[in-house]
């Protein structure tokens, strides 16, 4: 495929990804899935800069990320390194919590009111956040 | 012009605690993170942790937790920084600093802390 | 936690001199590099940020490139206010991380 050079329309260029910010929510399997749909993926927190401007653009709501712990460890969507990657959570989180009743712990990862980070369930209809990088070859065919 | 003016210089007994207030003005204070950096004499900076004035979201360095507590009153466009528990090694002086693009653009004067018995 | 490591850990030049200071990080760090000045008795000043660009303000013989592990501030052609202490410091993640300094002094 031909590499992509500028952001989709109604998407927002930002140190040469682009990002798109939902207005509705899903559970985070449709959201993940609706940004494999875009050629996207759900949005993978590299920096400091990159967390200030996500929360420039959600504001204080509950957002998705491409951040999940649903096979063991905890891991971002674009296979980028949790370990020794950028971190942003709330104190005391992620904590796996049981005790909402809705069976299982907290598994996938979203942003709060407050910009910092917390686990919960991955059914919740939260807004969610779809990114591309511009630099990565687009899947379309090129225009002949 | 941005400006961060900090309280005076404090000495302390260990075991004590100090509280540190910073007030900012030339610009709009809840738009910026504020950080706070301390330096023990002849020793380089240590980053502490920051405050979100807007929504009073804070994260600490690990080696703060528990000791440090950072809020601000947005009313006078100032941010305080405690630090409890004090110990001899915590003599330094005391920075914060605005939170600018992968920097801090705009610091305090500092204010030093000595803490001894 | 990322560690900043500075070389050297002290210069002597001569006004005019052209000087380089390296500053490495443990881990890539991509752009989210700041280098300061600090004199005694003062704070800290932002000299660049992003690697490479120049803080409003600042004189145009200061200039920093690099990005991911390995990068250099040069001043171009020392002046006698620039005698300082240089810090470089990684602001990708928390917590966030100074090299040691780099002192550049009177030959």
């Known amino acids: 495929g031909s590499e992509r050079t500028c952001c989709p329309v109604n998407w927002v260029e930002h140190e040469r990804s682009c990002y798109w910010f939902s207005r509705s929510g899903k559970a985070w399997a449709d959201a993940d899935n609706y940004c494999r749909l875009e050629d996207a993926h759900l949005v993978v927190v590299t920096s400091w800069e990159e967390q200030k401007f996500v929360q420039r653009h959600i504001g204080p709501v509950n957002t998705w990320m491409g951040l999940h712990d649903q096979n063991g460890p905890w891991k971002w969507v674009d296979g980028t390194d949790y370990e020794t990657g950028f971190k942003n959570w709330r104190p005391e989180q992620p904590d796996d919590w049981y005790g909402h009743g809705l069976g299982g712990g907290e598994d996938c990862a979203h942003f709060t009111d407050d910009g910092r980070w917390n686990d919960d369930v991955c059914q919740r209809p939260y807004r969610w956040v779809c990114e591309t990088e511009l630099d990565k070859a687009s899947q379309e065919p090129p225009l002949l | 012009q941005v400006q961060l003016v900090q309280s005076g210089a404090e000495v302390k007994k260990p075991g004590a605690s100090v509280k540190v207030s910073c007030q900012a003005s030339g610009y709009t204070f809840t738009g910026y993170h504020m950080h706070w950096v301390r330096q023990a004499p002849g020793q380089g900076l240590e980053w502490m942790g920051w405050i979100n004035p807007n929504n009073n979201a804070t994260n600490y360095a690990q080696k703060f937790q528990g000791r440090v507590t950072m809020t601000r009153d947005t009313s006078i466009s100032t941010a305080y920084m405690e630090l409890r528990r004090l110990r001899s090694d915590d003599t330094a002086v005391y920075h914060c600093a605005r939170d600018g693009t992968s920097s801090f653009d705009y610091w305090g004067q500092g204010t030093l802390v000595t803490v001894s018995s | 936690d990322i560690q900043m490591t500075q070389s050297p850990s002290s210069v002597s030049a001569s006004v005019g001199d052209r000087v380089t200071i390296t500053c490495r990080a443990s881990q890539g760090i991509r752009k989210w590099l700041a280098w300061y000045q600090q004199k005694p008795g003062k704070a800290p000043k932002l000299l660049i940020y992003?690697?490479?660009s120049l803080q409003s303000g600042v004189p145009s013989r200061f200039s920093g490139s690099g990005s991911g592990t390995d990068f250099t501030l040069t001043i171009s052609s020392l002046q006698p206010e620039d005698f300082a202490t240089y810090y470089c410091?990684?602001?990708?993640?928390?917590?966030?991380?100074f090299g040691p300094g780099t002192k550049v002094d009177i030959k």
């Open positions: 992003a690697a490479s």
């Open positions: 410091q990684q602001a990708n993640s928390f917590p966030f991380t």
